[in-house]
Each structure stands twice: as C-alpha cells, then as structure tokens.
C-alpha cells in the first residue's frame, strides 16, 4: 500500500509535470506566437484511456514529436530550450509511471492538435492530483 510520503512525492511530481505542461501551453497560446497556425497542423496521438499513472506511457511516446514542434518557436516562447524542457518532463514521467510493468499504450483513432494534446494531459494530471489530496 502506498505510504503518505510516497503519495506526497507522487503528488509533487504530478504538480511539477502539470506546471511544465501548462508552461508549454501558455507559450504556444501566447498571442505573440506567430507559429501557432503552423503548430496546429501537426498531429498528436491521444490515449484511448488515461486514468492511471501507467497511462503516462502514452505521453512519454509523444514527447519526441512534441519537442520537434516546440523547436519551431523555441527562442520567443520558452525560457528553457525544448530539449531541456522535454528532458525534464521525461524524467518525471519515467518516475511516475514506474518501470516495473511494461504497459502497451492504446491510442484513440482521432488525432489531436498540440493544444488539445496538452490540455488532455493537463486534465489527466489535475484528475490524479485530486484523487491524492
């Protein structure tokens, strides 16, 4: 059974992930971002189901394409280089989902824009955090 300290650690990591995802979304949605139209043309893939930490596998698998799209607007919209930003997210995701079980991500048929993709994972973080508090 999870201890209160491990629950607290998970909560902090989820909050950190949430902040990182929100920061990316804010950078993209920045009214000064001339790349938004182009960024919205890229397709991202969403999980069929995202209710448990193991489902973060689906986020991990889309981090490389996310980094490539963020590279399009790196200097004007983000304090960190996309490579560093995604690297930070990757570390948190790996810790949160754990490496004990190999989970095969199942993706939904319809694709999403980068904004829809980020919003989906922000909602996921908020939902898990609310169950922990």
């Amino acid at each position: 059974a999870p201890t209160s300290s491990s629950t607290k650690k998970t909560q902090l990591q989820l909050e950190h992930l949430l902040l990182d995802l929100q920061m990316i979304l804010n950078g993209i949605n920045n009214y000064k971002n001339p790349k938004l139209t182009r960024m919205l043309t890229f397709k991202f893939y969403m999980p069929k189901k995202a209710t448990e930490l193991k489902h973060l596998q689906c986020l991990e698998e889309e981090l490389k394409p996310l980094e490539e799209v963020l590279n399009l607007a790196q200097s004007k919209n983000f304090h960190l280089r996309p490579r560093d930003l995604i690297s930070n997210i990757n570390v948190i995701v790996l810790e949160l989902k754990g490496s004990e079980t190999t989970f095969m991500c199942e993706y939904a048929d319809e694709t999403a824009t980068i904004v829809e993709f980020l919003n989906r994972w922000i909602t996921f973080c908020q939902s898990i955090i609310s169950t922990l508090t």
């Epitope: 790349k35 043309t41 893939y45 889309e62 490389k64 490539e68 790196q74 200097s75 004007k76 993706y107």
Partner: antibody, heavy 121, light 113 residues
Framework: QVQLVQSGAEVKKPGSSVKVSCKAS????????IHWVRQAPGQGLEWMGW????????NYAQKFQGRVTLTADTSTSTAYMELSSLRSEDTAVYYC??????????????WGQGTLVTVSS | DIVMTQSPDSLAVSLGERATINCKSS????????????LAWYQQKPGQPPKLLIY???TGQSGVPDRFSGSGSGTDFTLTISSLQAEDVAVYYC?????????FGAGTKVEIK
C-alpha cells in the same frame, strides 16, 4: 516547380568566413524550413541546422553552434549560411535543402545543387 | 544523437539482380501513435545532390521507380532494388527523420558486377 539555386564555389583561407546563398523559387520561402547539410570529399552527409524564413527561428546542430549563422531574406526568397573560423576540415560541398512537408525534420525532398567550399592556405 | 549504421559499405550486383542494403538505428524510429517509422532513403550520384527515394521507411517518393522499396520497423531497415539497372549505380544513404538532429548512415556504394 520547387528549385533551390546556390551560389558558386569558394576558396577560403583558414580562419576566415564564407557565406553561401540559396535562392528558392517555385514556392513561397516562408512555407517551410530551409536546412543546411554538408558533405566532405568522399564522406557522408552531415546536418548543420535549419532556419524558418517566416520569422528567422533557427535550430543548429550542436557541433556548429557558435560558428554557423543562418539567415533568410524573404524579399529575395534567399537563405544564407555563414560559417566562420574556417579550418581545413570544413572543406566540403554545402547543400541547402527543403523538407517534403512542414514537420521540422521531414525528409529532404528538394536540394540545391551544392556549393564547394575549399579551405586552404 | 541517434546513430545510423549502414551495411555493407559497398555492394556489387549483376544487372537485373536484386540489391539489398541494411540500416540500423541506435534508437527505435517507430512512433507508436501512428505506427510510422521515421526513416528515409536517398540516392546520390557523383557530382549531384542526394535524391529522396523513400520516407516513412516504405513510402516511395513521387516519380521514383517501383523497383526501389523500403521495409523494416523499429531499429532495422532495408532498401531493396528488385532488379538493378545501370542508372542505379550510386551511393545510398539512410536517414532518421524522427528527432533533431536528423542523422545519416555512412552510405553504401552500389556498383555493377
């Protein structure tokens, strides 16, 4: 049709700089990224970086960071690659290339004819 | 950076025979979301720029003869020329187009036996 036409061959002294141009036609230069790839004599292909002519956003390969400068002039539909502090190992054919689509590193479907840069004292 | 390893370095094949070139990547190039492998093949003839033949591991570029085909998934890929023609003498390169920096294999020289 899409065409990328590069400037002519250059012979440079070690320590100097070279600026290669790449004029795009057959499409709007702001529609996609322009990449630069080099090839040393008898060697393979090495990606140097890309520029988005729409707003000048750039992404350099770590190896060339600080030594290469990519720019673009949308009024003349021309992209430029300037390499400074030249050394003999920089002797190569330099290519500009355009992606197949607009994904940042989509495969390179269109290439310039190449510009041979020779660095020799 | 993703390292691309090609084999063999060179290959001599009789006209009309099959030529097979292999390419291995140090990381998987498969994006699970769309089941696409981000791997391209180029042909380069002396004094010319590379020419895109295949992308997404198996999608032929417009105008490329159908004797050229690509296969493979994850980290192992193959370019096949089903019936070698004289004009196919060239150096062939694989390239990953998944993550920055895009990286190329060292090339395979195809000659006529």
């Amino acid at each position: 049709q899409v065409q990328l036409v590069q400037s002519g061959a250059e012979v440079k002294k070690p320590g100097s700089s070279v600026k290669v141009s790449c004029k795009a036609s057959g499409y709007s230069i702001t529609d996609s990224l322009i990449h630069w790839v080099r090839q040393a004599p008898g060697q393979g292909l090495e990606w140097m970086g890309w520029i988005d002519p729409e707003d000048g956003e750039i992404n350099y390969a770590q190896k060339f960071q600080g030594r290469v400068t990519l720019t673009a002039d949308t009024s003349t539909s021309t992209a430029y690659m300037e390499l400074s502090s030249l050394r003999s190992e920089d002797t190569a054919v330099y290519y500009c290339a355009r992606s197949l689509d607009s994904y940042p590193i989509d495969p390179f479907a269109y290439w310039g004819q190449g510009t041979l840069v020779t660095v020799s004292s | 950076d993703i390292v691309m390893t090609q084999s063999p370095d060179s290959l001599a094949v009789s006209l009309g025979e099959r030529a097979t070139i292999n390419c291995k990547s140090s990381q998987s190039l498969l994006r699970n979301g769309n089941q696409q492998n981000y791997l391209a093949w180029y042909q380069q003839k002396p004094g010319q720029p590379p020419k895109l033949l295949i992308y997404y591991a198996s999608t032929g570029q417009s105008g490329v003869p159908d004797r050229f085909s690509g296969s493979g998934s994850g980290t192992d890929f193959t370019l096949t020329i089903s019936s070698l023609q004289a004009e196919d003498v060239a150096v062939y390169y694989c390239q990953q187009h998944y993550v920055t920096p895009p990286t190329f294999g060292a090339g395979t020289k195809v000659e006529i036996k």
